[in-house]
């Protein structure tokens, strides 16, 4: 069947999700495409516990997550509600800063060196994290 019952090779399982941590950089859209071709998505952080898990694996390195406001409001790539969900922005962020001189503002979110979030220019080549959920069908205990 098409169910994913265990994580692919080189992915890390945590709380019924699988995570893959890049060691090279891409622009946000290209990182997003990479994850999608793995039948996954850029990581969606839904709790402090998940934040700490991801932070532990990426270390103090700028790393893309699946959060952007390229079409106006902030949105998670998997449809998770942003307004009511977990957030971990740095103070004064997001600020949609235009002073970088690269044109436009800042529409893509990343983990900073201390794990808190910042919005930045989507073209910057940061590392990224892919996430895919283990299928609900595989979460049910086997019948005895």
């Amino acid at each position: 069947g098409s169910e994913r019952t265990c994580c692919p090779v080189n992915w890390v399982e945590h709380e019924r999700s699988c995570y893959w941590f890049s060691r090279s950089g891409k622009a946000w859209a290209d990182a997003d495409n990479y994850c999608r071709l793995e039948d996954a998505h850029l990581v969606v952080v839904t709790s402090w516990e998940e934040q700490k898990f991801v932070q532990h694996h990426i270390g103090p390195v700028n790393t893309w997550m699946g959060l952007h406001d390229q079409n106006g409001p902030w949105k998670w790539v998997d449809g998770t509600d942003y307004e009511t969900g977990f957030k971990n922005w740095r103070p004064e962020q997001p600020d949609d800063w235009y002073g970088h001189g690269l044109g436009g503002g800042e529409d893509c979110a990343h983990f900073t060196d201390d794990g808190r979030w910042n919005d930045d220019v989507c073209q910057r080549p940061y590392r990224w994290v892919c996430e895919t959920e283990l299928d609900k069908a595989s979460q049910e205990p086997p019948l005895l």
């Epitope: 098409s2 080189n10 090279s24 891409k26 622009a27 990479y34 071709l37 793995e38 039948d39 080549p125």
Partner: antibody, heavy 120, light 108 residues
Framework: EVQLLESGGGLVQPGGSLRLSCAAS????????MNWVRQAPGKGLEWVSV????????YYADSVKGRFTISRDNSKNTLYLQMNSLRAEDTAVYYC?????????????WGRGTLVTVSS | DIQMTQSPSSLSASIGDRVTITCRAS??????LNWYQQKPGKAPKLLIF???SLQNGVPSRFSGSGSGTDFTLTISSLQPEDFATYYC?????????TFAPGTKVDIK
Amino acid sequence: EVQLLESGGGLVQPGGSLRLSCAASGFTFSSYAMNWVRQAPGKGLEWVSVISGRGGSTYYADSVKGRFTISRDNSKNTLYLQMNSLRAEDTAVYYCAKRIAAGMEYFDLWGRGTLVTVSS
Amino acid sequence: DIQMTQSPSSLSASIGDRVTITCRASQSISSYLNWYQQKPGKAPKLLIFAASSLQNGVPSRFSGSGSGTDFTLTISSLQPEDFATYYCQQTYSSPPFTFAPGTKVDIK
């Protein structure tokens, strides 16, 4: 043996349709994104399309978008390319290729190709 | 999309020669660069991935270098079986997985 084998090529009139197949063996087919790459006679390689391992994501070159559809049947270890509204410039050898992803992406396995000729 | 160019488009060389082929990207692609070899009537074959990593089974006379926008494929001592066309491919901004036009290596 690890291999890819394309089929379904042939002569078709402009505006016609054709479906190519690529049979995979020797590896866990559903674990890999798969590509179609084409090569017009005497020309270079042109990437055409890619589909993720479980079929959830697809991408196309601008030159074929809206005319070609990539799909796969993992139960049959087979990749497909449905080609509609064919044009003379689609004449090429079509290769399927397996994508390896380890941060850096590359195509480590290719089929031998199948020739598609679009002509009246 | 990122544009890829290769030079020269063709070259003539002798057995034992050191051959160098250059690939250039229209913007930085870090090390997301692969090299393929294709012989007439055959499918392409992966030689080098990630700019400098040699694919399993590929002779050590092939090597790749470079990062950013400029890359090089070197054949340290050309052998008879190396006469072919060589293509570079970027996978930084992808898809599309863009190929360069290729370099044909033939016998002098």
